[in-house]
């Protein structure tokens, strides 16, 4: 997260760290007791490493009573996701067992009504992604509150030049932005999961290149079918 600040510890009990061989790779969001939603491209970077999900964490390194690392029973990328595009960039991870819920571990309600979030709405994005252009990684969870940007502006030739589909949404990226390592993390608007950080190689913190998020409401049928 660029230009953000440290999150209040455990105030985002849905927040997950998707890890490979014990290292943070991507963000994720607990959407059901045994399921974490993330970005499909995160799996590409995992290669053949052991994928696990850390729940209940604020610090990645320090011991915390609520922290627990779960093995992944099944990884289900969206069937239409492709390595060369950010379309359908969603991944569902089934934990090896149901998560132990508590104040620091709790699924987040996700948006099912397939309608755009109003531009100007302030939404929270959080993650353990890089906090500087130099690539500095934080140990503790960071967050930033960003305004949603209208799709027409996001699709301008000077911005994302028509690449933003109806199944995506954008948020402002003027010095404050999601970045490398935040992919798969949640964009939360008023207590409801609206978007998942896409995992392209987009430049971060440049206002002409807004943050791109996959709209979960657009994938409600797929999510329901996998969770069923």
């Amino acid at each position: 997260i660029l230009g953000g600040r440290e999150a209040e510890a455990h105030a985002r009990p849905y927040m997950a760290s998707v890890q490979v061989n014990g290292e943070h790779l991507c963000g994720g969001v607990l959407v059901a007791e045994q399921w974490v939603l993330s970005a499909a491209h995160c799996l590409e970077d995992a290669a053949d490493g052991k994928v696990q999900v850390l729940l209940g964490a604020h610090s990645l390194s320090q011991p915390e009573p609520s922290k627990r690392l779960y093995d992944v029973l099944r990884a289900v990328p969206h069937p239409d996701s492709r390595p060369d595009t950010i379309d359908h960039d969603l991944l569902l991870l089934q934990l090896s067992e149901k998560a132990t819920l508590g104040p620091a571990v709790r699924p987040l309600p996700w948006q099912r009504v397939d309608r755009d979030v109003e531009p100007g709405t302030l939404c929270d994005v959080a993650g353990w992604g890089i906090v500087s252009h130099a690539g500095r990684r934080p140990d503790r969870l960071q967050h930033v509150l960003l305004p949603v940007l209208d799709r027409a502006t996001c699709n301008r030739r000077t911005h994302h030049d028509g690449a933003i589909t109806q199944r995506m949404m954008c948020a402002e990226s003027n010095r404050r932005d999601s970045c490398k390592g935040d992919s798969g993390g949640p964009l939360v608007c008023g207590g409801v999961l609206e978007g998942v950080v896409t995992s392209g190689s987009r430049v971060c913190g440049n206002r002409k290149k807004p943050g791109i998020y996959t709209r979960v409401a657009s994938y409600a049928a797929w999510i329901d079918s996998v969770l069923a």
Epitope: G3, A11, E118, T121, A126, R175, V188, C189, G190, G191
Partner: antibody
């Protein structure tokens, strides 16, 4: 403690412009959105727009686009609102207010300035 | 824009009574609602955020409830300092519009 101190009352002629200020203290000015709200005499509250002092990003109520211009001066922790081409119906009290954050993504206007009265009259 | 319909517009009550003010949103606002109190000639003060949470320093006789499109503010055992105007405001989308207000007067 958090305080938002607004500039004093203004008497302006129709068609003129006025710039009112809101000086913040007691918190990190660049971390919180500042809103502006209009209240006509004996009437309710109307949201004008917000500015994020850290980046200068703004967002306006469609109704106030072209009417209000929001700016900040980070060095003095002051937010400004310029109101232009004022007709008599812009006579109102204008408030600045900070967005406080709650939990992961809830917010509300937790601290308000005392209000600036703008009277448009010839 | 989401419309916020507040009722009643005015209310005349006695000290010690309990009052409920309601706010109806034109669509689901997912508990993204705040309540404010405003005394004559003063700025509004935050009472409740996220529909049900009391802001710091607000007496426990105030309580917020509701979900979806229907919300209410209840004041138990009214005190003399509770008289004034009350406004709801949503934060689900932009612009974050206010209700028309409820004026609470002493009977």
């Amino acid at each position: 403690q958090v305080q938002l101190q607004q500039s004093g009352p203004e008497l302006v002629k129709p068609g003129a412009s006025v710039k009112i200020s809101c000086k913040a203290s007691g918190y990190t000015f660049t971390d919180y959105y500042i809103n502006w709200v209009k209240q006509r005499p004996g009437q309710g509250l109307e949201w004008i727009g917000w500015i994020f002092p850290g980046s200068g990003s703004t967002y306006y109520n469609e109704k106030f686009k072209g009417k209000a211009t929001l700016t900040v001066d980070k060095s003095s922790s002051t937010a400004y609102m310029l109101l232009s081409s004022l007709p008599s119906e812009d006579s109102a009290v204008y408030f600045c207010a900070r967005y406080g954050y709650y939990g992961s993504s809830f917010y509300a206007m937790d601290y308000w300035g005392q209000g600036t009265s703008v009277t448009v009259s010839s | 824009d989401i419309q916020m319909t507040q009722s009643p517009a005015s209310l005349s009550v006695s000290v010690g009574e309990t009052v409920t003010i309601t706010c109806r949103a034109s669509e689901n606002i997912y508990s993204n609602l705040a309540w404010y109190q405003q005394k004559q000639g003063k700025s509004p003060q935050l009472l409740v955020y996220a529909a049900t949470n009391l802001a710091d320093g607000v007496p426990s006789r105030f309580s917020g409830s509701g979900s979806g499109t229907q919300y209410s503010l209840k004041i138990n055992s009214l005190q003399s300092e509770d008289f004034g105007s009350y406004y709801c405001q949503h934060f689900w989308g932009s612009p974050p519009t206010f209700g028309g207000g409820t004026k609470l007067e002493i009977k």
